[in-house]
Amino acid sequence: KLLQVSTIAMQQQEKLIQQERALLNFTEWKRSCALQMKYCQAFMQNSLSSAHNSSPCPNNWIQNRESCYYVSEIWSIWHTSQENCLKEGSTLLQIESKEEMDFITGSLRKIKGSYDYWVGLSQDGHSGRWLWQDGSSPSPGLLPAERSQSANQVCGYVKSNSLLSSNCSTWKYFICEKYALRSSV
């Protein structure tokens, strides 16, 4: 009889431990949920306020039609320039039209004067074809004016109102491009 009572008591104690564990898990889960909810709310708030304050382009970027442009203040080789743009959610400038070229060169004149700026144009080593970074061909009027005599990889850059070519390992400023945010209003 005593053994039976002792067994029941042990079972009850085991049940109690399990329930305590479950309660602890539940409390922990509830706390975690509350924290996540708080975090989510903060994130949403943040997103909403930044969406509310957002202009089509980030600070220090220039807008023209559907694009935003960033003119770098540092020099780098072409490949590093490409990575610097990606870091900002953009790519090296891809000039689609004479109008865009005019806008860029006009803006550069106002900002910095006559320096060299890498754009997203490079020459295929085998075929010698010029291609933008997305693989598309430049329109005939937007081909670099002079063929670089470099044995190394050749990339395109803008200077004054011309598109020129140079060894990709030389140091230049660069221009990044990203799509402008569409206004939801």
């Epitope: 994130f43 990606l86 870091k87 900002e88 959610g89 953009s90 790519t91 970074q133 997305d134 693989g135 491009e177 990203k178 799509y179």
Partner: nanobody, 116 residues
Framework: QVQLQESGGGLVQTGGSLRLSCAAS????????MGWYRQAPGKQRELVAA???????TYADSAKGRFTISRENTRNTVHLQMSSLKAEDTADYYC??????????WGQGTQVTVSS
Amino acid sequence: QVQLQESGGGLVQTGGSLRLSCAASGSIFSFNAMGWYRQAPGKQRELVAAITDGGRLTYADSAKGRFTISRENTRNTVHLQMSSLKAEDTADYYCTIWTRDRQQYWGQGTQVTVSS
């Protein structure tokens, strides 16, 4: 912390195709860009292709016309479809992501071997 999990690497014949995938997880809501680098034995790591959050694309010269990068917004996943593979495409391929705070994270890498 952000985790990147690559898959799809393997052994393929010259001229064959392969599709690499990379899924980002962890504390990530959105990103600035995602892409692929590769490193062949004894060579420097080089950018193969990348896609920005706005959908802008960039490819290495060696990838143009043969490789296509795409992404699934809903799952923070990026794919690299590689076709007309050559022996010189043999390398370890690493997925990378640039987050909103401009940090760059890397995956562990997946091996691609193109045999003739």
